[in-house]
Structure formats: structure tokens, C-alpha cells
């Protein structure tokens, strides 16, 4: 029977800069029941606080609700593992909420084939930012990426859309059914999951174009 091994805080994420959750990985348990606690202080403070919510994020997690989350203060946190034989501590981790944002996927992806009389046809798509993200404050710049492929193809074709919420693609295979998805990333954070796939049937008379894609 031994003291517990060193735990590791291996992930922190925020959906919107207003709340966040951190998760830790236990070290070896030393063959005894082990208690874990996450303690933190904020920059400029010496007072240590204990995790406000061990439940919301699931096992081995600490959730910081709105009243505990500040974008302006760095959090310095560590996990303590204790059993009857002793204790061990994780490395300290510095967390700036700006750098852990992983938004929900974009919403309302719509895809249409446009066939204007005077120009080549194209695939047009638009979407909305995730609901939890408030872009009006200027704290967020969301970047978008689109991927699409014929239904039976193995490889995805990926396009970076920058900050636009609509996009044109001019080069597609006529008669094919395509899957289209979009994801987003804040300028300093992590890519969201891909949105649910939207399917679009490309007409057989769709004229292939040499130009690949075009940003609005």
C-alpha cells in the first residue's frame, strides 16, 4: 500500500467564456481509496479556493459556473490526491479562459444549388454561429471551416471560410449526392465538433467549373 500517484489536469474547456470545466486524470491509487480535490487561486490572490462544483462535468472534473468564471483573471490550479498513506499533487496549471474556448458547432447549415442564367452554377451554403457565442462584444472572432464529399467518397474536401457565414463552391461532380458540414473556432481556442451533415443532390446538368471556390 502506497500514497497515490501524481494526478494530471489534462483538459480545460469553455463553451463561451462564461463557464468552464477542467478534468484530471488520477495517478496510481496506491491500492487504497483515494480522495481528490482541486484547489485554485486567481492571479493577484494568495487565498486558495476549492473547486465549486465536482458534479456537473462528470467524474474527475471541476466545473466553474458563471459566478466563478472571469475572463480577466488567470486561474492557477492543482489537484491533490490523498489516501491513508499520504498525498500527491499535480503540476500547477495556469488557465486563461480566453484560451480554452471550444464552441458548439455552427447552426442552421443550409445548402442550395444555384443556377443563375448568366453565370456558371454553384453550391451555396450558409450557417449561423452557435447560440452561446456573443459575437457583438468583440471578444470573439469565429473562424469557419467547411468540409464536403460525395456520399460514397472516402476523402473530404476542406475549405477555410474565414469569418464569413456563407460560402460558394463552384467545382462539383454532377449527379452526385454530397455531404456538407461546417465547424468553427475562436481565434485563440479550439475547433468545435462538425455540425450534423447536410445532404445535397447535385443535378446531372451541373456544369463543372475550373475555379474552385469563392468567398462572399
Amino acid at each position: 500500500q502506497l500514497p497515490p500517484g501524481k494526478p494530471e489536469i489534462f483538459k480545460c474547456r469553455s463553451p463561451n467564456k462564461e463557464t468552464f470545466t477542467c478534468w484530471w486524470r488520477p495517478g496510481t491509487d496506491g491500492g487504497l481509496p483515494t480522495n481528490y480535490s482541486l484547489t485554485y487561486h486567481r492571479e493577484g490572490e494568495t487565498l486558495m479556493h476549492e473547486c465549486p462544483d465536482y458534479i456537473t462535468g462528470g467524474p474527475n472534473s471541476c466545473h466553474f459556473g458563471k459566478q466563478y468564471t472571469s475572463m480577466w483573471r488567470t486561474y492557477v490550479m492543482m489537484v491533490n490526491a490523498t489516501n491513508q498513506m499520504g498525498s500527491s499533487f499535480s503540476d500547477e496549471l495556469y488557465v486563461d479562459v480566453t484560451y480554452i474556448v471550444q464552441p458548439d458547432p455552427p447552426l442552421e447549415l443550409t445548402v442550395e444549388v444555384k443556377q443563375p442564367e448568366d453565370r456558371k452554377p454553384y453550391l451555396w451554403m450558409k450557417w449561423s454561429p452557435p447560440t452561446l457565442i456573443d459575437l457583438k462584444t468583440g471578444w470573439f472572432t469565429l473562424l469557419y471551416e467547411i468540409r464536403l464529399k460525395p456520399e460514397k467518397a472516402a476523402e473530404w474536401e476542406t475549405h477555410f471560410a474565414g469569418q464569413q457565414t456563407e460560402f460558394k463552391i463552384l467545382s462539383l461532380h454532377p449527379g452526385q449526392k454530397y455531404l456538407v458540414q461546417v465547424r468553427c473556432k475562436p481565434d485563440h481556442g479550439y475547433w468545435s465538433a462538425w455540425s450534423p451533415a447536410t445532404f445535397i443532390q447535385i443535378p446531372s446538368d451541373f456544369i463543372m467549373n475550373d475555379h474552385h471556390h469563392h468567398h462572399h
Partner: antibody, heavy 118, light 112 residues
Amino acid sequence: QVQLQQPGAELVRPGTSVKLSCKASGYTFTSFWMHWVKQRPGQGLEWIGVIDPSDTYTNYNQKFKGKATLTVDTSSSTAYMQLSSLTSEDSAVYYCARGDYSNWFTYWGQGTLVTVSA
Amino acid sequence: DVVMTQTPLSLPVSLGDQASISCRSSQRLVHSNGNTYLHWYLQKPGQSPKLLIYKVSNRFSGVPDRFSGSGSGTDFTLKISRVEAEDLGVYFCSQSTHVPWTFGGGTKLEIK
């Protein structure tokens, strides 16, 4: 404890390429972004770019686009930087550095001295 | 790119003295989120740099309280209240508010 291990030195010919390695240990490699920094002898530091090992997203200093290519091998917890078309201007110490969930460097490798010489 | 200008280039001090290093940025370093990402690193001879101060005035873990940082906007200062032998080396300021992140040219702290 967190360690970033880099080879001590590389001697390379002008016009060739070199691939520098940075082996991470003591933490979950895919959890934190890895940066690369250049230091010419007796001079200041230059940020080259950063890679997110979890999905290989990269962001480069415009000055090093086309010169440096950042990659990772998650199976060996190793970050790489390839430098191409080497000239004497590329002779420098190159550091890999890790932040936490922040935008400063908490951990640094020992650096690899690249010497470009015929 | 944001240019970081450090003064002086070299700072000869006697052990026990106070030392002060200035860092000026060519643009304001206040991020859109309200934070100022100005940091200080110390590089001792033959070693890689080590973080001393983050976000203007916060001492990194294990950094003695004789180190302090201050400033705002474009003007920042690192002070060492009583210089010890282990403090000798090159001090760099760094900004990570604007991409690309940039560093000052360094200030060499040496014994008078």
C-alpha cells in the same frame, strides 16, 4: 514532471532542409499547444509559430511561412519543425516551448543549435 | 508586427542593489478581452529562457518576491529589489496580445 527534450546540435549544408524534434514527456501531449522560437547567437528571440497536437492546426509568424513547417507525431509525443532552403541566416538555436492554457511559455526545451555551413 | 524596445541594453549592478529594466511597445498591449499580455523571461548563460512574470505584474510559481512588474498601455518595467548573484543573465520582455508574438532585444544584467 514536464520535459521537452531536443537534440543538442545539427550541422547542415546550405540549400538543404533539416527536421528538428522535440520529445515531450510528463504530460498529455495532445492537451497543450507547442510553440517554436528562434534565437540567433547573441540576439533576441523570435516566435516562429504554434501547433495544436490534438488536430494539427497551425499558426505561423508570417516571416517564417514557407521556411518552417510544424508537424507532430502523437504516437511518440514528439513535435517537429522542418526548416527548408537553409542559409546562414537560419543558423540559430531553436527552442520548442509549451504554454499551459495561456499565451506565455511555461516550459522550454533546451534548444537545438542549427549551424548552416558548407 | 509589434516592436518591443528594451532599455538599457546592459545593466551593471552591485549585489544587493535595485535594478530596473524598461520595455516599450510600438502598440498598446491591451487585448480585446481586457487583459494585457506582457511577460518577462530570464535567460541565464547556456540555458533556455524561464518565465518570471506574466501579464505585467504576476510572479510565476517559485519566482522570488524581489521581482516585480508594473506598467500599462505601452510602457512596462521590471524591478529587482535586491539583486542576487543568481539573477544575472539576459532579461526579455515579450508580448502575446498581437500575433505574431514578439520579444524585446534583451537586457543583460551583470555585476559592476
